[in-house]
Amino acid sequence: KLTIESTPFNVAEGKEVLLLVHNLPQHLFGYSWYKGERVDGNRQIIGYVIGTQQATPGPAYSGREIIYPNASLLIQNIIQNDTGFYTLHVIKSDLVNEEATGQFRVYPELPKPSISSNNSKPVEDKDAVAFTCEPETQDATYLWWVNNQSLPVSPRLQLSNGNRTLTLFNVTRNDTASYKCETQNPVSARRSDSVILNVLYGPDAPTISPLNTSYRSGENLNLSCHAASNPPAQYSWFVNGTFQQSTQELFIPNITVNNSGSYTCQAHNSDTGLNRTTVTTITVYAEPPKPFITSNNSNPVEDEDAVALTCEPEIQNTTYLWWVNNQSLPVSPRLQLSNDNRTLTLLSVTRNDVGPYECGIQNELSVDHSDPVILNVLYGPDDPTISPSYTYYRPGVNLSLSCHAASNPPAQYSWLIDGNIQQHTQELFISNITEKNSGLYTCQANNSASGHSRTTVKTITVSAELPKPSISSNNSKPVEDKDAVAFTCEPEAQNTTYLWWVNGQSLPVSPRLQLSNGNRTLTLFNVTRNDARAYVCGIQNSVSANRSDPVTLDVLYGPDTPIISPPDSSYLSGANLNLSCHSASNPSPQYSWRINGIPQQHTQVLFIAKITPNNNGTYACFVSNLATGRNNSIVKSITVSASGTSPGLSAGA
């Protein structure tokens, strides 16, 4: 069947349209195009005779039409009046006629729209704004954009006038945005430039910063005020109601108590005509003088004198505080505070009362500390100590004794041997001693300030010494929880005391430790790994003492249950498997691995590169200690999942 297709159907003014003929019959004589829905000679556009290939214009021909041999009609430079129906009349060779009708629509090419507004500076929560998209155009659709997004759903937004007008009721500061309108028809779409809505608002209640309201005399006061406002607010400061200055910041250097009061910031918006104020109360405190401590006795004598420490200066209605050794005062019957806390009395001072002492004056803002004061407590001398503590020496060695007594001021020392004064030194030295140097050695300590003296007497015996002992053992490598070990101190000697030490300490109380054979033998029953320590024996008699070299007990233990790390049991295909096995053991255990029961390597670490699901299975670590005759093992299941199917556990080492 003969049909007409319009390409395009919607045509922009000035463009062209092709009326394309489909299913044109064979054996044609000619054809004619007509404007309208029927054949009307008065509205013929053009006729065409195939035999002569002659085109003949009709009454409706405008000079913009071109007819093609296939009967299609091209109309150029389209105008609005071209809209409508077009009829093709086909005359066949048998003079039978056929007709077909097509149509198209003509639309203007839209101009770039613009936005007009009824209010360029609306006030927040008060004004409405109506935006209108210009120009008004027939058959056009109007769209609106806010910040390049389609319109939000809001009861304050209303479209009217065929969507050509957008009204914002009760504007808020959040309506400050970029607005665009767009016009569309079937042949074009154009978007306007953006219009920024400038909403006037504020000022909001101003904020004064910093929030601090307490200041110390002599500081600078620097207050800043801010209020949200469009246009930006103008600021004014008032102190106790009196206008100060029209600035956003208020600066007063070196403030005094007189600057205390109420500070008001006023924010004004010249466009909205609104004012808002905020008040802060500033308190300026006087700076007290730095305190200091006086004492009624700068050199008190221990257990005799009392000392009164006074915090200066005296200030009315002030709280006084005290510290000793940077701590608050301890509770002690020897410490007394006066009613106003200004005087601290130490009754019967001791050498531990040296301090340092500090006092403080508290005001509303802070506490001011005095410099520390240290007491010079005179004490001693205490009973002197003679070192070293040895009383037995062998002939031929040098005797070097040192005396010390706690004393302030430091003590003066004197040495006496068998009651005879020797020298006035802290140290006494006698070279190459013999048995004749045995006797009573007295150290006398004297404190020149207190006039007190104290003495200590030490008996020194010079005699041939005992031999250095040694330890023999019945088992150098006992097995934990199985063996006992007997240590014997050699040699056996008459009138000798045997002593034992473990790791430099005297023997612990334990039911597993037993001394026998006059303390010469030390037996450890059921040894544990914790018994692997250094054992020393000592011998002494009335004239000398000696110690053995340490013997370290090498306890064999383990292997304990091994641990396989890392703990992960799920791996991804393609990862490296790096398992490490560890077991506490002495000696170190021998390690071996089995995978699904098949023996692998004898290493502590099992490494398999690029594992696949074929590596799934049980991984067993075996540990063996031939010395204890014990074995242990642990089994771990490993699952390898194909890449992408892992439950998200380790991807291997």
């Epitope: 150098s476 000696p587 170190s588 255990p589 021998q590 290493t603 031939l626 010395a627």
Partner: antibody, heavy 120, light 107 residues
Framework: QVQLVQSGAEVKKPGASVKVSCKAS????????LHWVRQAPGQGLEWIGY????????SYAQKFQGRVTMTRDTSTSTVYMELSSLRSEDTAVYYC?????????????WGQGTLVTVSS | DIQMTQSPSSLSASVGDRVTITCRAS??????LAWYQQKPGKVPKLLIY???NLVEGVPSRFSGSGSGTDFTLTISSLQPEDVATYYC?????????FGQGTKVEIK
């Protein structure tokens, strides 16, 4: 298969140093400790020391302390043994050998040996 | 250091004979003892470890036994290819020490 390939024979003068290499292949280099053992002509085997290729930790026999240095290069799976202050009694075949496992195991694979001759 | 003493230092036996080599340690080795075979001009080869564990591929005519300080290597039926020097070695911690070796020959 496991292979330990050692560097070639060396002739050194007394007082000099020698550095013998041992390249491992066919197993994970860092998993097994490598020992050095020497054998003087017509004599028995003498342990020199070992290196843990993973950490670089070394342990030497008292006799060689201060004269021997063992190092490793994990990028090439090679260990080195350097012996300094050479004397004529250091003339021997020097073997590198892999420990069968870790901790208290014997030596399962041996290099072909490197003859070091110390002569003036 | 631990001393390892092998005996005899050499022996000569006929093919098919049972051969025994002993190794004595100066301290208890708790079973950490290995045996090596070194054929003339070749490198040592590990036969046995942990006193009695045979290394894979070693003929079953070789066996090890012992405990404490005394250990034995036995060849149940001597073969011509067993001509070699055999060394014992303790492997309980370093320093490792070897026995002085036992040379085995065929009569």
């Amino acid at each position: 298969q496991v292979q330990l390939v050692q560097s070639g024979a060396e002739v050194k003068k007394p007082g000099a140093s020698v550095k013998v290499s041992c390249k491992a292949s066919g197993y994970i280099f860092t998993s097994y400790w490598l020992h050095w053992v020497r054998q003087a002509p017509g004599q028995g085997l003498e342990w020199i020391g070992y290196i843990n290729p993973q950490t670089g930790y070394t342990s030497y026999a008292q006799k060689f302390q201060g004269r021997v240095t063992m190092t490793r290069d994990t990028s090439t799976s090679t260990v080195y043994m350097e012996l300094s202050s050479l004397r004529s009694e250091d003339t021997a075949v020097y073997y590198c050998a892999r420990e069968y496992g870790n901790y208290n195991y014997p030596l399962d694979y041996w290099g072909q040996g490197t003859l070091v001759t110390v002569s003036s | 250091d631990i001393q390892m003493t092998q005996s005899p230092s050499s022996l000569s036996a006929s093919v098919g004979d049972r051969v025994t080599i002993t190794c004595r340690a100066s301290e208890n080795q708790y079973g950490y003892l290995a045996w090596y075979q070194q054929k003339p001009g070749k490198v040592p080869k590990l036969l046995i470890y942990n006193t009695k564990n045979l290394v894979e591929g070693v003929p079953s005519r070789f066996s090890g036994s012992g405990s404490g300080t005394d250990f034995t290597l036995t060849i149940s039926s001597l073969q011509p290819e067993d001509v070699a020097t055999y060394y014992c070695q303790h492997h309980l911690g370093t320093p490792y020490t070897f026995g002085q070796g036992t040379k085995v020959e065929i009569k």
